[in-house]
Interface confidence: low
């Protein structure tokens, strides 16, 4: 029943072109090129895509035509290496072009930049956008794909096509509406926020595959799919995990055409076999392909089968535990993970993986002991503290969130994380802490049974952002250690960090705390970011400052901004009152 067994094709590019259709082929090639060459102008990418498309058509017409038998990596890599300004724009990335496949593609992948030096996307006026949309819909949508792909070089390509479809639908509907802005802006905000979340989730999948290997990804997938499809048999879950791993390996490896094609096949397989997978798939499977695949990926957990027997019988009490483990270690551990996960939709995936790791470590030790059964008899007791740790942490943080609200909860995390890893750049600390703080509004509203999977798995995604940003410019051994030692223990590792006593406080720089009238025209979110940036800088100057001291300074700062934004001569107010605020803050913090 393998979805992916295919006959060999004389021409891979013709095969994918026919499978996907011209529109999807062109969109995916554009995404692939923009994710590799993130600085190239839009027009250059469109030209390259058109050239590749024309070539693909010649191969469709005659699969034996010259170069049609070349691999997609060879064809796409050759095309990327024709860019005239490669050396000037990308520096050492140009050296990739001297390599042969598959090393050349690996080289391009290593040069993907998670934080490219690109201007922030500024949203034009609604009328301007609608005019552009009506004037040339195709170019407008291509530009969307290009701008997202170059800023998010690991964005899940078939999912980006789904976002583009929704983007198009929003403009189609709203540009005809009486109040275009009221219709369009909330939709664009929703797409932006969902897009950032989708990008971050996919980035974790790629990091998992690239940094920790296929086994780590498969373990994650077994746990998640077993929670989602608890009625499916282990063999069915294993088959889905194998196929899903192939899809994500392809997308993370830049093989976007294969990835999109295989994802479509997997959605088709799931829908054709939904009776043996989940009762929750019916609605998803009635949708068109892009919506169907998205819906399946987000589908709610099916109900657990009634009367599942105790896990202890097969995994602790049985005399065959060590025999079964020795025969096929990963299969036995996979079965353990499947059985545990389908019984515990209330646990986070990372907790389930910690439990499986503990079980594996215990069997490794005990199956070599004189009395294995005696040795592993109490293994489930070792799980208790592992389960209680995230439960307690979430309880405490949700109480804090409910007490403070999102903005102040973010500020508490900003202070906490700046004290843990003060060497990390201020923009990264602000971005990561703001996202960590969003866990409150995202997860604390849920009942107890849904809090942990929501919170801890979300935190894994956010901490991965910290890890990939830090990897580009490593500045903290503590961050490197937490990021690289264990994928599933990243969050406990960061939670356990105390104030970094080795940190030498940053020199005070008045310029960092100088503000201007432009702050008054910023959106509430952007104003918050300005204030949070100042807060991080304060902590970097005075890491031993108490909560009370920091709160007093931040309250003064908020009052200062409010006062000067109401003043007639705003700029003068910011200059004069700003000096007073800096002096008062220095005094309050003993700087």
């Amino acid at each position: 029943r393998g979805v992916f067994r295919r006959d060999a094709h004389k021409s891979e590019v013709a095969h994918r072109f026919k499978d996907l259709g011209e529109e999807n082929f062109k969109a995916l090639v554009l995404i692939a090129f923009a994710q590799y060459l993130q600085q190239c102008p839009f027009e250059d990418h469109v030209k390259l895509v058109n050239e590749v498309t024309e070539f693909a058509k010649t191969c469709v017409a005659d699969e034996s035509a010259e170069n049609c038998d070349k691999s997609l990596h060879t064809l796409f890599g050759d095309k990327l290496c024709t860019v005239a300004t490669l050396r000037e724009t990308y520096g050492e990335m140009a050296d990739c072009c001297a390599k042969q496949e598959p090393e050349r593609n690996e080289c391009f992948l290593q040069h993907k930049d998670d934080n490219p030096n690109l201007p922030r996307l500024v949203r034009p006026e609604v009328d301007v956008m609608c005019t552009a949309f009506h004037d040339n819909e195709e170019t407008f949508l291509k530009k969307y794909l290009y701008e997202i792909a170059r800023r998010h070089p690991y964005f899940y390509a078939p999912e980006l096509l789904f976002f583009a479809k929704r983007y198009k639908a929003a403009f189609t509907e709203c540009c005809q509406a009486a109040d275009k802005a009221a219709c369009l802006l909330p939709k664009l905000d929703e797409l932006r926020d969902e897009g950032k979340a989708s990008s971050a989730k996919q980035r974790l999948k790629c990091a998992s595959l690239q940094k920790f290997g296929e086994r780590a990804f498969k373990a994650w997938a077994v746990a998640r799919l077993s929670q989602r499809f608890p009625k499916a048999e282990f063999a069915e879950v294993s088959k889905l995990v194998t196929d899903l791993t192939k899809v994500h390996t392809e997308c993370c490896h830049g093989d976007l055409l294969e990835c999109a094609d295989d994802r479509a096949d997997l959605a088709k397989y799931i829908c054709e076999n939904q009776d043996s997978i989940s009762s929750k798939l019916k609605e998803c499977c009635e949708k068109p392909l892009l919506e169907k695949s998205h819906c399946i990926a987000e589908v709610e957990n099916d109900e657990m089968p009634a009367d599942l027997p105790s896990l202890a019988a097969d995994f602790v009490e049985s005399k065959d535990v060590c025999k079964n483990y020795a025969e096929a270690k990963d299969v036995f551990l996979g079965m353990f993970l499947y059985e545990y996960a389908r019984r515990h939709p209330d646990y986070s995936v990372v907790l389930l993986l910690r439990l499986a790791k503990t079980y594996e470590t215990t069997l490794e030790k005990c199956c070599a002991a004189a009395d294995p059964h005696e040795c592993y008899a109490k293994v489930f007791d070792e799980f208790k503290p592992l389960v209680e740790e995230p439960q307690n942490l979430i309880k405490q943080n949700c109480e804090l969130f409910e007490q403070l609200g999102e903005y102040k909860f973010q500020n508490a995390l900003l202070v906490r994380y700046t004290k843990k890893v003060p060497q990390v750049s201020t923009p990264t600390l602000v971005e990561v802490s703001r996202n960590l703080g969003k866990v409150g509004s995202k997860c604390c509203k849920h009942p107890e049974a849904k809090r942990m999977p929501c919170a801890e798995d979300y935190l894994s995604v956010v901490l991965n952002q910290l890890c990939v940003l830090h990897e580009k410019t490593p500045v903290s051994d503590r961050v490197t250690k937490c990021c690289t030692e264990s994928l599933v223990n990243r969050r406990p590792c960061f939670s356990a960090l105390e104030v970094d006593e080795t940190y030498v406080p940053k020199e005070f720089n008045a310029e960092t705390f100088t503000f201007h009238a432009d702050i008054c025209t910023l959106s509430e979110k952007e104003r918050q970011i300005k204030k949070q940036t100042a807060l991080v800088e304060l902590v970097k100057h005075k890491p031993k400052a108490t909560k009370e001291q920091l709160k007093a300074v931040m309250d003064d700062f908020a009052a200062f901004v409010e006062k000067c934004c109401k003043a007639d001569d705003k700029e003068t107010c910011f200059a004069e009152e700003g000096k007073k605020l800096v002096a008062a803050s220095q005094a309050a913090l003993g700087l």
Epitope: H9, G21, A267
Partner: nanobody, 127 residues
Framework: QVQLQESGGGSVQAGGSLRLACAAS????????MAWFRQAPGKEREKVAT????????YYADSVKGRFTMSHDNAKNTVYLQMNSLKPEDTGMYYC????????????????????WGQGTQVTVSS
């Protein structure tokens, strides 16, 4: 609910031509996989041709390559099967099938399930 309606079948002498049509209604046709199947008496149903309606290029079974041409008209939500140089072994009931998948994979899922079927139209080729 997707509705598929075939037409254009009939009786013809060997070497003659027929043009089958399949009109689709009830779902967004722009990204569908459409196929023509046929079933001769006492034989298994076989896929003859398939096309992705978001693209241009059909796939054909070896037995009909060079004789049959499949095309689509998105404006009319209709696919066609132009059958030339007909042979007696082309006789059978011809069914139109649709699947809202991304593309048509004869290679990977020649025998894949199609969720939506027409009632069929009879083609008889006599020698």
């Amino acid at each position: 609910q997707v509705q598929l309606q075939e037409s254009g079948g009939g009786s013809v002498q060997a070497g003659g031509s027929l043009r089958l049509a399949c009109a689709a209604s009830g779902y967004t046709y722009s990204s569908a996989c459409m196929a023509w199947f046929r079933q001769a008496p006492g034989k298994e149903r076989e896929k003859v041709a398939t096309i992705y309606t978001g693209g241009t290029y059909p796939y054909y079974a070896d037995s009909v390559k060079g004789r049959f041409t499949m095309s689509h008209d998105n404006a009319k939500n209709t696919v066609y099967l132009q059958m030339n140089s007909l042979k007696p072994e082309d006789t059978g009931m011809y069914y139109c099938a649709a699947d809202a998948s991304w593309g048509c994979r004869l290679s990977g899922s020649w025998g894949a399930k199609y969720n939506n079927w027409g009632q069929g139209t009879q083609v008889t080729v006599s020698s």
